[in-house]
């Protein structure tokens, strides 16, 4: 296993619709053809997997049908979008990149993007 640098923004504020997008960029030392990207969430010292996708270079990222993540790739950049976020989902989202094929296997883990989610204010009751 060889180490690889992964860069991601330090902080992002999700949209009022609970959508957060950020780029995860990795310094590929070679010509990988198969890449696996995993998004981890760290909160209260607990780390959980949010979503993961394996893709062939030049192809779209394919997450599971029920995943809250979507993404696109371009060169050594992966543009990740996480949707359906609520205030309780605020936390540190870490991008993990693995170059699966061809060997050697490379692993890179970013410092994390602190995503803040603000629940929209409830609309005031209106009399008709």
């Amino acid at each position: 296993c060889k180490a690889m640098h992964v860069a991601q923004p330090a902080v992002v504020l999700a949209s009022s619709r609970g959508i957060a997008s950020f780029v995860c960029e990795y310094a590929s030392p070679g010509k990988a053809t198969e890449v696996r990207v995993t998004v981890l969430r760290q909160a209260d010292s607990q780390v959980t997997e949010v979503c993961a996708a394996t893709y062939m270079m030049g192809n779209e990222l394919t997450f599971l049908d029920d995943s809250i993540c979507t993404g696109t790739s371009s060169g050594n950049q992966v543009n990740l979008t996480i949707q359906g976020l609520r205030a309780m989902d605020t936390g540190l989202y870490i991008c993990k990149v693995e170059l699966m094929y061809p060997p050697p296997y490379y692993l890179g883990i970013g410092n994390g993007t602190q995503i803040y989610v603000i629940d929209p204010e409830p609309c005031p009751d209106s009399d008709f």
Epitope: P9, A10, V11, V12, L13, A14, S15, S16, S21, F22, A87, T90, Q114, Y116, I118, D119
Partner: antibody, heavy 116, light 106 residues
Framework: QVQLVQSGAEVKKPGASVKVSCKAS????????ISWVRQAPGQGLEWMGW????????NYAQKLQGRVTMTTDTSTSTAYMELRSLRSDDTAVYYC?????????WGQGTLVTVSS | EIVLTQSPGTLSLSPGERATLSCRAS?????LAWYQQKPGQAPRLLIY???SRATGIPDRFSGSGSGTDFTLTISRLEPEDFAVYYC?????????FGQGTKVEIK
Amino acid sequence: QVQLVQSGAEVKKPGASVKVSCKASGYTFTSYGISWVRQAPGQGLEWMGWISAYNGNTNYAQKLQGRVTMTTDTSTSTAYMELRSLRSDDTAVYYCGRWVRGVEYWGQGTLVTVSS
Amino acid sequence: EIVLTQSPGTLSLSPGERATLSCRASQSVSYLAWYQQKPGQAPRLLIYGASSRATGIPDRFSGSGSGTDFTLTISRLEPEDFAVYYCQQYGSSPWTFGQGTKVEIK
């Protein structure tokens, strides 16, 4: 090294607007947020809101909603805070700061005086 | 909005003594920071995430607590530690500050 340099002191009349700038250097501007905090003379700190320089999304204090606008110019690594319909109780030192989980780097502060 | 109440309002201590500052929230808080401010200066971040020390902060400063009760402890007061200390919650919008605790020389 990380630096945040704010625009100079302003004197405004009630009802006017003020726009304070905050020029960042020494780091990747779009990777961080910019938070705005003010402090009235002899008083404590008041959070005004923040902007994600990465995507331009904003989160404002409820009491200032409708009067405040925070923006960024990523080409010059500068953040702006505009406050409209100024009142005498808006007289304060206005600080910008680099935000992630708390403000680790601060501007020097901009004194805004609202007086007729 | 979450109201943060700091106590005591003023703490009179001598250099070398231990300082314990309290910050109580009106409802549960998930993220809390502590700042130090000296007259005529911008605040300085000491602690984020309730217990993580910011870069360059001496280890005599420590933060603890969760939920609604948080504490900033200065194990041995140095002359430069006499200042006003603020807590800030940033887990629930609007983010809010406490009213501050002044640590003065006895």
